[in-house]
Every structure is written in structure tokens, then in C-alpha cells.
């Protein structure tokens, strides 16, 4: 958790986040671990620290090494380590395993491939996507925000997908590429312990007082017909129907999808006219089947009037 691997290609931008999380007001100092030498914060440097972020603009092979970040509150210092490796660009098309981000799997309907680490960068849409070094073309491929959507996925769609985007820093542009493998599931029906795709565990959802808000509980249970599978919301450990707040209702979203895909269920929690007291509640997304129950907790926080991007993933 507090030692994180990061990698990039020479002459591309690489931005690394301190694995230690702190409040925005806490100071973060970065050091070269081997020499204990402080990393400068001045943006004129090719490698510089910017709060929780360490920026290589652009990266060089010689930058490889372990970097220490120390997050300082008034009374506590907490340390994280970033293990950075910068590789030379490959002359051929093959992307070696050590440059690959985590493999994602898809099924026939609405497969999404997220562009890894993109949230750390100052980029503008659209992303460019490549499969095995070939630019993706055709109506089946849709670049949407930070992910690629492939319609009607086939087994032939498996392969290595690279996203390419431009990071802008003080008017200067730097290229970034990231690659991950995509596999297409084609197994017989099976049942798994529920996997909640959304919300993330302990997610903080920003809402505006007086406005409506929707929370989606989305979970997958395996493939094929599921004999017992359910998703539901609880408020402070109580079923929505028993909670007795008419402003807060749940309704089923997208039903199970069986055509070569995972069996998944959505349940949407609709909060009408969000009130202050709603921020005090604990919202639990529950997914259960014959294997057991999984719970992800969401909390609401008031949306700031000025919506600046969080420095956290």
C-alpha cells in the first residue's frame, strides 16, 4: 500500500502519486531514497515535486529508482515509497510484460477498457486508442472520457490496447502512452462470490443540497443463469423499505445480461431533494448470492461550490 510501483517510457511524461494519502493542507516532501536528496518543487526542473505528485516532464531512463515521500501533518510524519522504472522505447510493436498495466476482461456487451493512470494527468479528450499498434477505427470502437467502449465484443478483440494522450503543463505538451491486455471471456456458466463494480469501497459521493442524487449499486455474480442473486441498498443498516424516508427510493437498473457476458445486476438509489441529514447516513450497497454477501459503503459529502479536481485517485 505504501510502496507503489510506477513505470513509464523515456521522453514521455510520468506522474507518480505518493502512496501515502494526506489532507490537501499537509505538506509533502519528496526525496531520492538512495541519496536522501530533496527533489525540487520549482516547475522549471525536469523532475519536480508538486504536493502529492512527483512529475517527470519528460522522463529519462536515469530517473529509475526509489523515491521517498513524507507527508507531514502538524504532529505526524508518514512515509511512502514510489518505485519508479523508466524504460527505453521499443523499436518494434511488441509491448513487453513489464510495461503492461493490469489485464481487464470483457464480455459481449459494453466492454470498457480504462486508460490506466490517466486521472493523474492534465489531459483533454479525445484519447487515441491502438490495438497491437494499429489505430482503432470503425463504429464498434468508441473513445468515451477515459475509457474505450467496444460494442459486440468478439474473441478476436482480445489483445493489447494502448491509450495515448497529451499531458499539458504550463503550456508545454508531453505525450503519454499506457498499455493493458484485454481478454474476452467465453466460459460456460458459473457462479462467483459477488463482485461489486460500483461503488468503490468507502467511496465519497459529492452531492448538492437541494438537488437530486443517484447512487448505483452494480455487482456481477458469474456467468449464465444465477439461481440466487440480488443487489440492494441499505441506509444505516436498514432496508430502504423499512427506513421510511419517501425521498429515498431504490429501483432496479439494468437486468442480468447473459449473451456471452457476466450476469450482473444494478440497483439505483434515488435521493430526491438532498438534505443535510442525508449526509449523516451510511449507504451500503449489498450484493448477495449463494456464495455469500459483499458490502460496499458509500458516504455523501457536500459538493464544494468551486469543483476543483481531487488530488486523489
Amino acid at each position: 500500500k505504501f510502496s507503489k510501483q510506477s513505470w513509464g517510457l523515456e521522453n514521455e511524461a510520468l506522474i507518480v502519486r505518493c502512496p501515502r494519502q494526506g489532507k490537501p493542507s499537509y505538506t509533502v516532501d519528496w526525496y531520492y531514497s538512495q541519496t536522501n536528496k530533496s527533489i525540487p518543487t520549482q516547475e522549471r526542473n525536469r523532475v519536480f515535486a508538486s504536493g502529492q505528485l512527483l512529475k517527470f516532464l519528460p522522463a529519462a531512463v536515469a530517473d529509475s529508482g526509489i523515491y521517498t515521500c513524507i507527508v507531514r501533518s502538524p504532529t505526524f510524519n508518514r512515509t511512502g515509497y514510489a518505485n519508479v522504472t523508466i524504460y527505453k522505447k521499443q523499436s518494434d510493436c511488441n509491448v513487453p510484460d513489464y510495461l503492461m498495466y493490469s489485464t481487464v476482461s470483457g464480455s459481449e456487451k459494453n466492454s470498457k477498457i480504462y486508460c490506466p493512470t490517466i486521472d493523474l494527468y492534465n489531459w483533454t479528450a479525445p484519447l487515441e486508442w491502438f490495438k497491437n499498434c494499429q489505430a482503432l477505427q470503425g463504429s464498434r470502437y468508441r473513445a468515451h472520457k477515459s475509457f474505450l467502449v467496444i460494442d459486440n465484443v468478439m474473441t478476436e478483440d482480445a489483445g493489447d490496447y494502448t491509450c495515448k494522450f497529451i499531458h499539458n503543463e504550463n503550456g508545454a505538451n508531453y505525450s503519454v502512452t499506457a498499455t493493458r491486455s484485454f481478454t474476452v471471456k467465453d466460459e460456460q456458466g458459473f457462479s462467483l462470490f459477488p463482485v461489486i463494480g460500483a461503488p468503490a469501497q468507502n467511496e465519497i459521493k459529492e452531492v448538492e443540497i437541494g438537488k437530486n442524487a443517484n447512487l448505483t449499486c452494480s455487482a456481477c455474480f458469474g456467468k449464465g443463469t444465477q439461481f440466487l442473486a440480488a443487489v440492494l441498498w441499505q441506509l444505516n443498516g436498514t432496508k430502504i423499505t423499512d427506513f421510511g424516508e419517501p425521498r429515498i427510493q431504490q429501483e432496479e437498473g439494468q437486468n442480468q445480461s447473459f449473451s456471452n457476458g457476466l450476469a450482473c445486476l444494478d440497483m439505483v438509489l434515488r435521493i430526491a431533494d438532498v438534505k443535510e441529514e442525508d449526509l449523516l447516513l451510511q449507504y451500503d450497497c449489498l450484493a448477495l448470492n449463494l456464495h455469500g454477501l459483499r458490502r460496499h459503503t458509500v458516504r455523501l459529502s457536500r459538493k464544494n461550490p468551486i469543483d476543483h479536481h481531487s488530488i486523489y485517485c
Epitope: Q21, E276, R299
Partner: antibody, heavy 123, light 107 residues
Framework: EVQLLESGGGLVQPGGSLRLSCAAS????????MIWVRQAPGKGLEWVST????????AYADSVKGRFTISRDNSKNTLYLQMNSLRAEDTAVYYC????????????????WGQGTLVTVSS | EIVLTQSPATLSLSPGERATLSCRAS??????LAWYQQKPGQAPRLLIY???NRATGIPARFSGSGSGTDFTLTISSLEPEDFAVYYC?????????FGQGTKVEIK
């Protein structure tokens, strides 16, 4: 100097209610998550509840969920624990404590504690 | 929830001796583990955070080590004021949980 002072404990019958208070001083109260921890006589420590600095997010131990409510008044630098439907097993010394790191979605240690207030649930 | 198991339950030692207290987690807590000292009639006092960092004002004879599931609190040379109950606590996820405590008593 950071100080936390609990009050409101006492003897209450099963099924009854009690409201504990914790007066804080010596630090910017609204910037810190606050926690209630309890300790049954001769037993170990048990986390009860946490409230984020802005007061909008709370978390509870399963043993008290639905019966206890944590709240805070940042203008008064005071933390509260409203305890309803009290049971004999809620008998304990209740401590309020401060989480000095408190980033959203994460927890940390408790660096300052009050001296505690005893709650006895008995008929 | 993550269960923390402390051992031994009681440690009988003399002043000047070395004390070694163990805390084992039911699943990995990385280094999100703290140690507290509690004396009779008093609130707990933070000794160690992030498994190995001494809190402000804690004497150097207290040290923590470990990561993942196995942790150790070591008191290199017991002073008379060190005889107390020691608790470990994990804070990687809610609910926050404590070990059942180890009592360090005078032999």
C-alpha cells in the same frame, strides 16, 4: 494544550437513553475526525463510532448501529453520543478521542483521549 | 472485521528486562497498526503509529516492528512506569479494532 473532557455518564435502566458530551479545546476542532471508544469494566477497548470533521460522515460499530448517534457542534467545539435502547452490555467507560490525520475514506490512530465517563446500564 | 490477537495475555518481568509483545492480524493491515499503553484508571496513550514510528514524546526504549499480519512491540529495558496494559489497533479499514491487550506486570 489539547484537552478532551467527557460528561453525561451515569446509571440508566435497560431500554433507556443517555447523551454523552465531549468538550474539546486546544485545537481547531472542525479540522479533525472525532471518535468514541468504550471499555467495559476489566475488558479491552472497543471502537464505537467516528464522525468526520465537517460532521457529514459517520460510521458505527455493528453493536451500536441503529441505537447510537454520533454528532458534533463545531461552533461549540463539542462532540456528542446519543445512546438509545441501552442494554446491559453497553455498560462501559466511554472515551472520546481525536484522529489526527483523518483523510476522507481512511482512518488513523487516536492521539488524544479524554479521561472517560462511566455509563452503567442496570435495573 | 479484522481480528487482532495479542500474546501473551500476561508478561511477568522485572525492571531492566526486555519485553516483547506480539500482535497478529487475521488479514493483512500493511503497516496500519498502532500500539497504546494504558494504566489503571487512565485513558490509553499512543506509543507507536504506522507499525514502527514513535509518537511525539515517547521514549526511545519503545520500538515497533512488523508489517502485514505480524507485529511486535519491544520495550528494550523496562522502567517501573512501563508496567501497564498494552493494546494494538488496526486502522486500515472500518471497523477499527483493538487487540485484547497484554498486561506487563512486575515479576
Amino acid at each position: 494544550e489539547v484537552q478532551l473532557l467527557e460528561s453525561g455518564g451515569g446509571l440508566v435502566q435497560p431500554g433507556g437513553s443517555l447523551r454523552l458530551s465531549c468538550a474539546a479545546s486546544g485545537f481547531t476542532f472542525s479540522s479533525y475526525d472525532m471518535i468514541w471508544v468504550r471499555q467495559a469494566p476489566g475488558k479491552g477497548l472497543e471502537w464505537v463510532s467516528t464522525i468526520r470533521g465537517e460532521g457529514g460522515t459517520t460510521a458505527y460499530a455493528d453493536s451500536v448501529k441503529g441505537r447510537f448517534t454520533i454528532s458534533r457542534d463545531n461552533s461549540k467545539n463539542t462532540l456528542y453520543l446519543q445512546m438509545n435502547s441501552l442494554r446491559a452490555e453497553d455498560t462501559a467507560v466511554y472515551y472520546c478521542a481525536r484522529d489526527p490525520w483523518s483523510t476522507e475514506g481512511s482512518f488513523f490512530v487516536l492521539d488524544y483521549w479524554g479521561q472517560g465517563t462511566l455509563v452503567t446500564v442496570s435495573s | 472485521e479484522i481480528v487482532l490477537t495479542q500474546s501473551p495475555a500476561t508478561l511477568s518481568l522485572s525492571p531492566g528486562e526486555r519485553a516483547t509483545l506480539s500482535c497478529r492480524a487475521s488479514q493483512s493491515v500493511d503497516d496500519d497498526l498502532a500500539w497504546y499503553q494504558q494504566k489503571p484508571g487512565q485513558a490509553p496513550r499512543l506509543l507507536i503509529y504506522d507499525a514502527s514510528n514513535r509518537a511525539t514524546g515517547i521514549p526511545a526504549r519503545f520500538s515497533g516492528s512488523g508489517s502485514g499480519t505480524d507485529f511486535t512491540l519491544t520495550i528494550s529495558s523496562l522502567e517501573p512506569e512501563d508496567f501497564a496494559v498494552y493494546y494494538c489497533q488496526q486502522y486500515i479499514t472500518a471497523p477499527l479494532t483493538f487487540g485484547q491487550g497484554t498486561k506487563v506486570e512486575i515479576k
